[in-house]
Interface confidence: low
């Protein structure tokens, strides 16, 4: 449940617009080296379930948390906006770093410079004693639902249960679910969106909405981006993942509402239990649901889910699987692109997305699932590019 | 039934504007795309381009991205083709037809537009 | 674009006889995720507009009579009428929708 590193060796971090390698000794150094600057605005990402902003230090080569000391909201904001978050900041506070962290960045109020790495130095002292912990949206919370929802072998969901999933539609037709990360930006599977299923045009989003008949009254949101991942293998089904911008953004409400993308440090346990949502066949070879549907399903750890027995080696980093073994509860068909959360420190947070199987609840087949952890800087990369 | 009602004929000036009707009934207007396709005389069928009634999204064939103009107007059911600039080569049939996932399954009768001083 | 080519141009058979019209597209219409070939089937008579026979390559349309059958896959595809019938003059035209929408040339059947 790690980044997946890139070509370079351990020292380098790879240009995404070149391709080139660069030294790590040169990420976040205030200077340029990759041809669209990409070195300098990778440069902060939110740590584990509590959202512990760190900045990376081209010094000590390595992520520290940010000390609370003399933080202020404008520091969140540009934080924010720096992850790819456009006008959008949540919340800021200082926390108890329970980590162990012995070395932390911390700002030089004395430095005029608006750029925040600037201002920020490395210390190995935090007066505070306090790091921040940063919200740049209000995701993955939902209303107090008391009854549990549960795709094969599933319940039907109730209306705000799972308040990010997305039916995705060509031609008034449900072919895919998808997951609200921001009011603009809709997480789905690549293979969703292969050729000729390519043109943001032909797609349709329908949000907050339970039945799938109810939503030829409605009036969905158009698409205008579908952005696929460029390592995606349409044979193996490695990267599966895309991501939709919305023509126009989304209104949250009770009913509609983002799911946090994970971040690093999560720690996942093994046979954690996990959720799956969608509109999908509700047995194998069978027809759309037209009612929302959401399971229980415990992930299954890749060594296992990888033995001769099971996906005997099909099971690459970039994917998660979760089921039982004995089959009984799985995703299936026009599931897929759908969400996988998960519920750790009171937030839901977008795990997989829904990916590929063989078949649908059959015993040693579970659902396999793109691993969303390994592709939130991929995420937010293209978050940023479009602003 | 499912029908799709177009004008038999429009006669227009070289030069001039003309604005192409189909008229929809006997389905839900605007959950089905709706397609233009362009047959000139003795030739094949060419794609013009599709607009959704509900959202109003277009879509265009590069070719006739700057010679057509698609529109709807919901309270009537109707989708529209604006052809501009109109000459002789634009002389054709017109049909509008709806999309049923990706194949056309409904088709208009066609308008013949002849263009000429 | 996918550039899409029907053969014969044109062709004239008597009435009962097996009828064969190819259509090639310059790349796959094949999608992995539906398995689905995104090539449909047109029938023009003389004066009239296009009518739908066949989609997703293989799938005849509802109302369609079984003598008329669609095959292929990828890139080679094949309009077949088993016995042609004498209402069976037209221009058949294939379509591509696999990256937005082209036609063929078309097939004129003519019956001797």
């Known amino acids: 449940w790690k980044f997946m590193g890139s070509k370079c060796s351990d020292s380098g971090i790879e240009c995404d617009s070149s391709g080139t390698c660069i030294s790590s000794s040169n990420w976040c150094d205030g200077v340029s080296h990759c041809p669209n600057g990409e070195d300098e605005n990778r440069c902060v990402r939110l740590y584990g379930p509590n959202f512990i902003l760190q900045v990376y230090s081209s010094q000590r080569k390595s992520w520290h948390p940010v000390c609370r000391d003399d933080w202020n909201e404008n520091y969140a904001r540009a934080a924010c906006r720096d992850m790819g978050y456009k006008n959008s900041f949540y919340s800021s506070q200082g926390i108890v770093d329970n980590s162990g962290a012995t070395s932390f960045m911390k700002l030089n109020t004395s430095a005029g410079n608006v750029d925040i790495y600037k201002k920020l130095y490395h210390s190995d002292a935090c007066s505070s004693k306090a790091v921040v912990s940063l919200r740049c949206i209000a995701c993955g919370v939902r209303s107090n639902l008391n009854r549990q929802s549960r795709i094969v072998g599933g319940q039907n969901a109730l209306l705000g249960a799972w308040p990010w999933q997305v039916s995705l539609h060509v031609q008034n037709i449900h072919v895919c679910g998808g997951s609200i990360i921001t009011p603009e930006w809709i997480v789905t599977a690549a293979h969703c969106v292969e050729k000729p299923l390519n043109s943001p045009w032909q797609w349709t989003a329908f949000v907050g909405t339970l039945r799938q008949s109810s939503m030829f009254y409605e009036k969905g949101h158009r698409v205008e981006k579908v952005i696929s991942h460029p390592n995606y293998d349409s044979k193996t089904k490695n990267n599966d993942i895309a991501l939709m911008k919305l023509h126009t953004p989304l209104t949250f409400n009770e009913v509609v509402k983002p799911v946090c993308l994970p971040n690093p440090g999560m720690m996942l346990e093994p046979e954690q239990h996990c959720w799956i949502s969608g509109w999908g066949a509700t047995q194998e070879k069978g027809k759309t649901s037209d009612v929302l549907n959401a399971a229980m399903v415990p992930l299954i750890e890749p060594r296992r889910c990888n033995n001769k027995y099971i996906y005997d080696g099909l099971i690459t980093p970039a994917m998660i699987c979760a089921g039982f073994l004995r089959g009984t509860v799985d995703s299936c068909q026009g599931d897929s692109g759908g969400p996988l959360v998960t519920l750790k420190n009171d937030v839901w947070w977008l795990i997989g997305d829904t990916s590929w199987g063989s078949g649908c609840a059959q015993a040693n087949r579970p659902g396999v699932y793109g691993n969303v952890t390994v592709f939130t800087d991929w995420i937010y990369r293209q978050m940023r590019a479009d602003d | 039934q499912v029908q799709l009602q177009q004008p038999g004929a429009e006669l227009v000036k070289p030069g001039a504007s003309v604005k192409l009707s189909c008229k929809a009934s006997?389905?839900?207007?605007?959950?089905?795309?709706m397609h233009w396709v362009r047959q000139r005389p003795g030739q094949g069928l060419e794609w013009i381009g599709i607009i959704h009634p509900n959202s109003g999204t277009t879509n265009y064939n590069e070719k006739f991205k700057s010679k057509a103009s698609l529109t709807v107007d919901k309270s009537s059911s109707t989708a529209y083709m604006q052809l501009s600039s109109l000459t002789s080569e634009d002389s054709a049939v017109y049909y509008c037809?709806?999309?049923?996932?990706?194949?056309?399954?409904?088709w208009g009768q066609g308008t013949t537009l002849t263009v000429s001083s | 674009d996918i550039v899409m080519s029907q053969s014969p141009s044109s062709l004239a058979v008597s009435a009962g006889e097996k009828v064969t019209m190819s259509c090639k597209s310059s790349?796959?219409?094949?999608?992995?995720?539906?398995?689905?070939?995104?090539l449909a089937w047109y029938q023009q008579k003389p004066g009239q507009s296009p009518k739908l026979l066949i989609y997703w390559a293989s799938t005849r349309e509802s109302g369609v009579p079984d003598r008329f059958t669609g095959s292929g896959s990828g890139t080679d595809f094949t309009l077949t009428i088993s016995s042609v019938q004498a209402e069976d003059l037209a221009v058949y035209y294939c379509k591509q929708s696999y990256n937005l929408y082209t036609f063929g040339g078309g097939t004129k059947l003519e019956i001797k």
């Open positions: 037809a709806r999309l049923l996932w990706d194949y056309f399954d409904y």
């Open positions: 006997g389905y839900s207007f605007t959950t089905y795309w």
């Open positions: 790349q796959s219409l094949l999608n992995s995720r539906t398995r689905k070939n995104f």
